[in-house]
């Protein structure tokens, strides 16, 4: 049994798939529970088992397809519930009628590289990963730099503002190791929110040529 | 086995308005859309809206806005479409079908003649 | 608005014959796209939703295919009955759109 507040929030990443998280605050008590996706015009459903990721929640992953297959459009309401069982049967934890494209949460951009690295600037590449065509260049980045001695979190964000896959950094040191990440978000989507992080690109810039000043 | 059965025929004069019903079975009413779907004589088909009866959500047809309406009975299991002001080239056969996949199941379709 | 612009408008041919029927998307659908045949007075039927999958009943000679812009109807041998008007139909964003039609006549 149940007792207590709960949460159930997912995002649709534009393709293929629906992540979604629960949280209880009551007890809950060792049982098997899962995430029920049933669109209201779609000839599919689909279930996946929710896991544990601390004491109170729980999360799960629904793949709807081929990571590339666009299964849903702006059109569609997905009925999302959570199912619980009790000795014989199901119990409906928690339930919503979710509209994919007002909550997206896109892959992280994958790919990273320099392509062209200098004593003060650099110039970064990557891809986003299973975005839709629907969003055409209705996209937005942000990116930031890690700098010798200071954490992720210090490291000022720069903000690309359109759909650019791509970054020239200025005004670095000479001879020193960076490190790199970016983030995308589609400007659609009352709830949308930005993707994880991309993996960090460690780079680092030329020394100063001997005899110059920098 | 699912069946959506429409009314009869209908002649109208310009600027009424006509009501056609659309009488589902065989399936849970409430849980699937009804699109309604028309065409004029010797023409294709023109999408003109749609209704999701358990929820009362309506999807128009920018063309039809203002002039139709979309209503359910789920005691029924019947969904109505009304369109007003008509003209000559409303003359058409009006169709409900379910939204399953695509349009699965259709109606045999509704005659509405517009003349003066 | 998606535009679906169908090809050939009209098609002879005869029985026994493999024939297609050829839709283009003004914009990319995924695979949101439907076939339809009508006959004379009649509602239409369906054929294949998702580009590829066949309704229930439907027989194996029809075939879709496609994704993104260009979608195909093939059947692959014409029966006395598959003479007909077919429609492609997107379902990917509103206002839903359908083709201009094709209609398929005995050669």
């Known amino acids: 049994a149940v007792n207590g507040t709960s949460q159930f929030t997912c995002f649709y990443n534009s393709r293929a798939n629906i992540s979604c998280v629960w949280s209880q605050d009551g007890a809950l008590q060792d049982t098997s529970c899962q995430v029920h996706a049933w669109p209201d015009r779609r000839r599919w459903n689909q279930t996946c088992e929710l896991l544990p990721v601390s004491q109170a929640s729980w999360a799960c992953n629904l793949i709807l397809g081929a990571p590339d297959s666009q299964k849903l459009t702006t059109v569609d309401i997905v009925t999302l519930r959570v199912l619980c069982r009790e000795g014989v049967r199901w119990r409906v934890m928690a339930i919503q009628d979710f509209k994919p494209f007002e909550n997206l949460r896109l892959m992280a951009p994958i790919s990273l590289q320099v392509v062209h690295v200098e004593t003060h600037r650099c110039n970064i590449s990557w891809e986003i990963s299973q975005a839709s065509h629907y969003f055409e260049r209705h996209l937005e980045f942000e990116a930031r730099t890690l700098s010798p001695g200071h954490t992720w979190e210090e490291a000022p964000l720069l903000t690309l503002k359109q759909k650019q896959e791509w970054i020239c950094l200025e005004t670095l040191t000479p001879d020193t190791q960076y490190e790199f990440q970016v983030r995308v978000k589609p400007l659609q989507g009352e709830f949308t929110t930005w993707s994880p992080w991309s993996q960090p690109l460690a780079f680092r810039t030329k020394p100063a040529a001997l005899g110059k000043d920098t | 086995q699912v069946q959506l059965v429409q009314s009869g025929a209908e002649v109208k004069k310009p600027g009424a308005s006509v009501k056609v019903s659309c009488k589902a079975s065989?399936?849970?009413?409430?849980?699937?859309?009804i699109e309604w779907v028309r065409q004029a004589p010797g023409q294709g088909l023109e999408w003109m809206g749609e209704i999701l009866p358990g929820s009362g959500s309506i999807n128009h047809n920018e063309k039809f806005q203002g002039r139709v309406t979309f209503t359910a009975d789920t005691s029924t299991s019947t969904v109505y479409m009304e369109l007003s002001s008509l003209r000559s080239e409303d003359t058409a056969v009006y169709y409900c079908?379910?939204?399953?996949?695509?349009?699965?199941?259709w109606g045999q379709g509704t005659t509405v003649t517009v003349s003066s | 608005d998606i535009q679906m612009t169908q090809s050939p408008s009209s098609l002879s041919a005869s029985v026994g014959d493999r024939v297609t029927i050829t839709c283009k998307a003004s914009q990319n659908v995924g695979t949101d796209v439907a076939w339809f045949q009508q006959k004379p007075g009649k509602a239409p039927k369906s054929l294949i939703y998702s580009a590829s999958y066949r309704y229930n009943g439907v027989p194996s000679r029809f075939s879709g295919s496609g994704s993104g812009t260009d979608f195909t109807l093939t059947i692959s041998s014409l029966q006395p009955e598959d003479f007909a008007t077919y429609y492609c139909h997107q379902y990917s964003s509103y206002p839903f759109t359908f083709g201009q039609g094709t209609k398929l006549e005995i050669k």
């Open positions: 065989g399936y849970t009413f409430s849980r699937y859309w």
């Open positions: 079908t379910r939204h399953y996949g695509s349009f699965d199941y």
